[in-house]
């Protein structure tokens, strides 16, 4: 004679408020004779959920017809699920006895938990921009999920990050949980086009994680490099001086020319170009008049980038005797 097994296939059953939950239970033998009852919890304080023979259980129906002679399926459905229904449910076989039935065997139990999917993760970056080689923090938050077990991963351009701290609250029992994670990211000079992704995976999402993103362009400031050069060719009595402002981000930039300490107000030609990595180059041309009286001309290109302290580069103009002769000849 086969030994009776009580099969409850689901360890965990996720349910949604208002929906119907099906709790499965099958037996492998019709013996011993006696009823199968459903309980929530264990021990003397357990709660009777369903008894076919007696009691009124308006929200509980059976999946199979329990009156059928060879029925081995004792699964039940509980309608209109509320948070009060969570817990572990056991189907229990009793052996017919006198005056009372005696508990014979219990199933392993099915934990019923409320399933609620996490909200889309929101990623927030630092309040102020930071330069490359420095570390910035990004936070990721997602709320309203249940059960508590959740996976959170951080990526920078698809590469998984390891320097982060994650908290799930509350620590105790709750209807819903929240997750907050802070990742530390070292900025690279080419990160203008980079992205950080916070990915949240939860049992309710069935393998399809939710993603939140932030662009490092909002967090990075790449300071410019300056180079001032004098063009070898001159136009009439003018020398062309170029200030090249390279590899900066963001675009916000003010450039001023000074001649021997005096700020020049006149218009200068300039071009702005974008590099492949998202940084910018700015080139400004300044025409200087050459005359006999101007032996020592010091030009300064000053750049104020993104509200930071100004940086400048100086150039002492080299005017050859030959150039001076030519320019004095050209002066009326």
């Amino acid at each position: 004679e086969e030994e009776l097994q009580m099969i409850q296939p689901e360890k965990l059953l996720l349910v949604t408020v208002g929906k119907t939950a099906t709790l499965h239970c099958t037996v492998t033998s019709l013996l011993p004779v006696g009823p199968v009852l459903w309980f929530r919890g264990v021990g003397p304080g357990r709660e009777l959920i369903y008894n076919q023979k007696e009691g009124h259980f308006p929200r509980v129906t059976t999946v199979s017809d329990l009156t059928k002679r060879n029925n081995m399926d004792f699964s039940i459905r509980i309608s209109s699920i509320t948070p009060a229904d969570v817990g572990t449910y056991y189907c229990v076989k009793f052996r017919k006895g006198s005056p009372e039935n005696v508990e014979f065997k219990s199933g392993p139990g099915t934990e019923m938990a409320l399933g609620a999917k996490p909200s889309a993760p929101v990623v927030l970056g630092p309040a102020a921009r930071t330069t490359p080689e420095h570390t910035v923090s990004f936070t990721c938050e997602s709320h309203g999920f249940s059960p508590r077990d959740i996976t959170l991963k951080w990526f920078k351009n698809g590469n998984e990050l390891s320097d982060f701290q994650t908290n799930v609250d509350p620590t105790g029992q709750s209807v819903a949980y929240s997750i907050r994670s802070t990742a530390r990211v070292v900025l690279d000079p080419w990160d203008v086009r980079s992205q950080v992704i916070c990915e949240v995976a939860h049992v309710t999402l069935q393998g399809d994680p939710l993603r939140g993103t932030a662009n490092l362009s909002e967090a990075i400031r790449v300071p410019p490099t300056l180079e001032v050069t004098q063009q070898p060719m001159r136009v009439g009595n003018q020398v062309n001086v170029t200030c090249q402002v390279r590899k900066f981000y963001p675009q916000s930039l003010q450039l001023t020319w000074s001649e021997n300490g005096n700020v020049c107000q006149r218009e200068t030609a300039s071009t702005l170009t974008e590099n492949k990595d998202g940084t910018y180059n700015w080139t400004s041309w300044f025409l200087v008049n050459i005359s006999d009286q101007r032996d020592d001309v010091v030009l300064t290109c000053q750049v104020k980038h993104d509200g930071q302290l100004a940086v400048s580069k100086r150039l002492a103009l080299e005017v050859t005797v030959h150039q001076k002769d030519q320019s004095s000849d050209a002066t009326p």
Partner: antibody
């Protein structure tokens, strides 16, 4: 053991509606998503989308938005694919497949498949 | 949408030979790639997931490799049951596009 059993072949006229069923057994139906895949005669596989059996949310590929609908009868562990206003180009075999995920809840592929349902649309 | 390109479209080989099928993604999909095998008139079967992990019950003569945009499936010492069609599919977001398939035939 885990099984996905689909309904039998269908012969329909253009403009009609077909509803294919996919009955799951051997696992908790509401724990895993159900994917739908189309395969034309002698053709490659086309992922149509999937339905989250827990939240009941469906994701459709652009080509399958409008006339196609995924639905569920969770108490019967069954997923359905309904195609409305059938066209000749809908003549194909349709597969349902379970979406598998790892211990960290990350999807990795379709581990169990139905046997396929052949739909023929002909006037 | 991410496009998946498989090559070759068809391939003839003999039992005992080694073959390699490649799959190229139109953009970086990291390791989010799955390989399936389908015999004529049957349902597809999961072979390899996450680019290189063999699914349960899949013989060790199968191996997957690659990441980013280039992937390959290698079958060592072909067996008669290995002949059929092979498909790659990415799962880096939606839609989870399949490759066009590679038909492996007996020479």
């Amino acid at each position: 053991q885990i099984q996905l059993v689909q309904s039998g072949p269908e012969l329909k006229k253009p403009g009609e509606t077909v509803k294919i069923s996919c009955k799951a057994s051997g696992y908790t139906f509401t724990d895993y998503g159900v994917n739908w895949v189309k395969q034309g005669p002698g053709k490659d596989l086309q992922w149509m989308g999937w339905v989250n059996t827990n939240t009941r949310e469906s994701t459709y590929v652009e080509d399958f938005k409008g006339r196609f609908a995924f639905s569920l009868e969770t108490s019967a562990s069954t997923a359905y694919l309904q195609i409305n206003n059938l066209k000749n180009e809908d003549s194909s075999t349709y597969f349902c497949a379970r979406g598998a995920y790892d211990a960290y809840y990350y999807y990795y592929g379709m581990d169990y498949w139905g046997q396929g349902t052949s739909v023929t649309v002909s006037s | 949408d991410i496009q998946m390109t498989q090559s070759p479209a068809s391939l003839s080989a003999s039992v005992g030979e080694t073959v390699t099928i490649t799959c190229r993604a139109s953009e970086n999909i990291y390791s989010y790639l799955t390989w399936y095998k389908q015999k004529q008139g049957k349902s597809p079967q999961l072979l390899v997931y996450n680019a290189k992990t063999l699914a349960e019950g899949v013989p060790s003569r199968f191996s997957g490799s690659g990441s980013g945009t280039q992937f390959s499936l290698k079958i060592n010492s072909l067996q008669p049951e290995d002949f059929g069609s092979y498909y790659c599919q990415h799962h880096y977001g939606s839609p989870r596009t399949f490759g066009g398939g590679t038909k492996l035939e007996i020479k």
